[in-house]
């Protein structure tokens, strides 16, 4: 039975040109995390594999940085980055858990600074 839950950074509003940290944390399960995929719509952004480490999709290499932890840092944000992002936790023996974060990137100045979300 899947008992785990995913906690996310929550939805975020950010400024064009800035950077943002997307993070998820899987709790309430003893399942082993084998891989975490980060996706936007149907595009794979990055993979963090427990054995092989990080792989960033070539088309995002310039603007996506791994971490902190299992999270993902998006840099040089554009309005086109507005959308829903998914953290997909592949675990054994539970299976797959998915977290969802919506990111809104605005032209004008946005008062959201200083990420305080940390993986426990």
């Amino acid at each position: 039975m899947m008992t785990g839950t995913i906690e996310t950074t929550g939805n975020i509003s950010a400024e064009k040109g800035g950077s943002i940290i997307l993070q998820c944390h899987l709790s309430s399960t003893t399942a082993q995390v084998t891989q975490v995929n980060w996706e936007q719509q149907d595009q794979l952004l990055a993979i963090c594999n427990a054995d092989l480490g990080w792989h960033i999709s070539p088309s995002f290499k310039d603007r996506v940085a791994p971490g902190p932890g299992l999270g993902l840092t998006l840099q040089s944000l554009t309005v086109n980055d507005t959308g829903e992002y998914f953290c997909i936790y592949h675990t054994y023996p539970d299976g797959t858990y998915t977290g969802r974060i919506f990111l809104e990137v605005l032209e004008s100045s946005v008062a959201e600074h200083g990420a305080r979300f940390q993986i426990p």
Epitope: T9, G10, N11, I12, S13, I21, N80, E104, S108, R116
Partner: antibody, heavy 119, light 112 residues
């Protein structure tokens, strides 16, 4: 003045599909997210999903995945919601609502479209 | 999904009364950047819902100052001082911090 003008009431048969339109005016259509909300069972409000007119990106309430399909026509500043394989459970009033920038709220709402599913 | 619970379900009032509506969420509505996306709406019969308060306590343009919002974390309140006839209807809170956004069940403000 911001306005969202929705299409008129619909009476449709079970199993059919239909499309509701929401024409936006008074602001730059591509600058704001468009949400869709269902009002059913008297007073219950349920978020269906949203679309980003700028890039066509969508986000759905999983309860409506496969039930609702959201699109936009930027040239006419119109958002659309197609409802698929309708049943009596889909009889409701449907609203489009503009997203308030920075605050994940809904600042302007359409007048609502009443959908009745009946044979 | 985040569960949003509103109380009371029904609120009988007299004109001139001051009332409070409570909205509680099953998890914190503060995101990792310290922002809380909690808004309040009034839905009058035969009309569309209208935004009253966003970001916990910000009044939307044109909303009278007898409406005020407060709270943090999981516990939020809408206060209406000096109830007027045009304030009657269904009140809803909406959390927009977590996907999918979820509404409270509503509070019906009606005359005693």
């Amino acid at each position: 003045e911001v306005q969202l003008q929705q299409s008129g009431p619909e009476l449709v048969k079970p199993g059919a599909s239909m499309k509701i339109s929401c024409k936006a005016s008074g602001y730059s259509f591509t600058d704001y997210i468009m949400n869709w909300v269902k009002q059913s069972h008297g007073d219950n409000l349920e978020w269906i999903g949203l679309i980003v007119p700028y890039n066509g990106g969508t986000s759905y309430n999983l309860n409506f995945k496969g039930k609702a399909s959201l699109t936009v026509d930027k040239s006419s500043s119109t958002a659309y919601m197609e409802l698929l394989s309708l049943t009596s459970e889909d009889s409701a009033v449907y609203y489009c609502a503009r997203g308030l920038q920075r605050f994940y709220a809904m600042d302007y709402w359409g007048q609502g479209t009443s959908v009745t599913v009946s044979s | 999904d985040v569960v949003v619970t509103q109380t009371p379900l029904s609120l009988p009032v007299s004109f001139g009364d001051q009332v409070s509506i409570s909205c509680r969420s099953s998890q914190s509505l503060e995101n990792s950047y310290g922002n809380t996306y909690l808004s309040w709406y009034l839905h009058k019969p035969g009309q569309s819902p209208q935004l009253l308060i966003y970001g916990i306590s910000n009044r939307f343009s044109g909303v009278p100052d007898r409406f005020s919002g407060s709270g943090s974390g999981t516990d939020f309140t809408l206060k209406i001082s000096t109830i007027k006839p045009e304030d009657l209807g269904m009140y809803y809170c909406l959390q927009g911090t977590h996907q999918p956004p979820t509404f409270g069940g509503g509070t019906k403000l009606e005359i005693k």
